[in-house]
């Protein structure tokens, strides 16, 4: 039950995280015009990964896409790449994890296969989250560097007479969305990996073996009862996951690679 909950929660958290990563990637407010200690302009500038926007005092907003690929800063290209990789890995992870969910039964898929898929999706979510966090952090670092550079020469004098307003940019809402979303995807991935350990028993506990007493067709399922002899008990103090009431045929599955430590 706990494993199913952990897996389900991991899936939901990752789903929210990936939705957040997609939202952050699409958002225009990666950097916003810094209004602190700056002349109050009647227009407000903000920029995203794909376009820059200007909101005028009338409320009219005009956005212009970056229609060049080669002319863009390498760092911006890197951030775009990281976010897209994060989204792609996250999307694949979600697809894999749907089939890996314990609560969803697909044909006669074994627990070992589900464990594999859960682990795979978990790793994908972790990498996806890390990509998003890395992308957002690279952009944030770029902003901080540019902020202090523009602060150093905020007003560039021309003959001491004319001043030029230097537009400084600070962290936009998308950065915070990206950081939170990346963190959630990462947490979801870790939860999936933890759920995978529960799905796959770490030692052979003879759960699937039928012991036939001579002349009788009675099947003993060691570990099912808390026998005082300790026979079939979890000698290593590790939780044995009993998948619930099943028919004998269902229980008799072949040992998988997860049964051997």
């Amino acid at each position: 039950m706990a494993v199913t909950a952990c897996q389900g929660l991991g899936f939901v958290v990752s789903l929210i995280g990936i939705a957040g990563i997609i939202a952050a990637t699409c958002m225009d407010q990666w950097s916003t015009q810094d209004l602190y200690n700056n002349p109050v302009t009647a227009v407000f500038n903000y920029q995203g990964l794909w376009r820059s926007c200007v909101r005028e005092s009338s409320g009219f907003t005009e956005c212009r896409g970056y229609f060049t690929l080669l002319g863009l800063p390498a760092m911006l290209q890197a951030v775009r790449a990281l976010m897209i990789v994060g989204i792609v890995l996250g999307a694949i992870g979600l697809l894999v994890s749907i089939f890996a969910l314990k609560c969803i039964r697909i044909g006669s898929m074994e627990d070992s296969a589900k464990a594999n898929m859960t682990l795979t999706s978990g790793i994908m979510f972790i990498v996806s989250g890390l990509c998003a966090i890395a992308g957002v952090s690279v952009f944030a670092n770029m902003l901080v560097t540019n902020f202090w550079m523009s602060t150093a020469n905020m007003y560039t004098g021309m003959g001491g007479m004319v001043q030029t307003v230097q537009t400084r940019y600070t962290f936009g809402a998308a950065l915070f969305v990206g950081w939170v979303a990346g963190g959630l995807t990462l947490i979801g991935g870790v939860m999936m990996c933890i759920a995978c350990r529960g799905l796959a028993p770490e030692e052979t506990n003879y759960k699937a073996v039928s012991y036939h007493a001579s002349g009788h067709s009675v099947a003993y399922k060691p570990g099912g009862f808390k026998a005082s002899t300790g026979f079939g008990s979890n000698t290593k103090n590790k939780k044995i996951y009993d998948g619930g009431a099943r028919t004998e045929d269902e229980v008799q599955s072949y040992p998988s690679k997860h049964d051997y430590v």
């Epitope: 009647a42 200007v54 537009t167």
Partner: antibody, heavy 120, light 113 residues
């Protein structure tokens, strides 16, 4: 067609207050900001403040040090500008103007002006 | 506040001739975000409110004759009337439409020579 009709001329004593109204018609009042500009005799135009309906934000020229208050009555499609603690140098023609949304980004329609005379 | 300086204060030009009015701002009116200059030109005739001519330094308002044109960027701007007509006699104002408080130039009185 777009029209901004202002209230009539006023004569005020120093220290008093004046409230000028500006009734808009021919467009959706809540879509466009209203700006207030004054012009003293023989002087340049002077921006006083504005009201932005899209975010209910009001901006004022610091020069007026809290003496000016811009309000509006949406149901009557009317904007108001109140100037308090009047002095003789406040004698001017007061204009309301509509700031266009998008293109042009400017004050595209103006009221006819309200002459306010401050005299003891 | 941004100081807008217009020159000349008054200008007398013959009918059909070119009239040029200059405007200089103490700070750049160029917005880096969209590379637009937020400078506006108005025409004011005696006893009338100002009339919008040019916005964003070079865009002509609809209904304004094409003999009116605006140019310039950053801090230096020009209003040009290519062929002066009798109805163009007025005072012309440039305005900073970028940084609060919005400020106007002192005006240039255009007359016929």
């Amino acid at each position: 067609q777009v029209q901004l009709v202002q209230s009539g001329a006023e004569v005020k004593k120093p220290g008093a207050s004046v409230k000028v109204s500006c009734k808009a018609s021919g467009y959706t009042f809540t879509t466009y900001p209203i700006e207030w500009v004054r012009q003293a005799p023989g002087q340049r135009l002077e921006w006083m403040g504005n009201f932005h309906p899209y975010n209910d934000d009001t901006k004022y020229n610091e020069k007026f040090k809290g003496r000016v208050t811009i309000t509006r009555d949406t149901s009557a499609s009317t904007a108001y500008m109140e100037l308090s603690s009047l002095r003789s140098e406040d004698t001017a023609v007061y204009y309301c103007a509509r700031r266009a949304y998008g293109y042009p980004y400017a004050m595209d329609y103006w009221g006819q002006g309200t002459l306010v005379t401050v005299s003891s | 506040d941004i100081v807008m300086t217009q020159s000349p204060d008054s200008l007398a030009v013959s009918l059909g001739e070119r009239a040029t009015i200059n405007c200089k701002s103490s700070q750049s009116l160029l917005n880096a975000g969209n590379q637009k200059n937020y400078l506006t030109w108005y025409q004011q005739k005696p006893g009338q409110p100002p009339k919008l001519l040019i916005y964003r330094a070079s865009s002509r308002e609809s209904g304004v004759p094409d003999r009116f044109s605006g140019s310039g960027s950053g801090t230096d701007f020009t209003l040009t009337i290519s062929s002066l007509q009798a109805e163009d006699v007025a005072v012309y104002y440039c305005q900073n439409d970028y940084i609060y408080p919005y400020t106007f130039g002192g005006g240039t009185k255009l007359e016929i020579k």
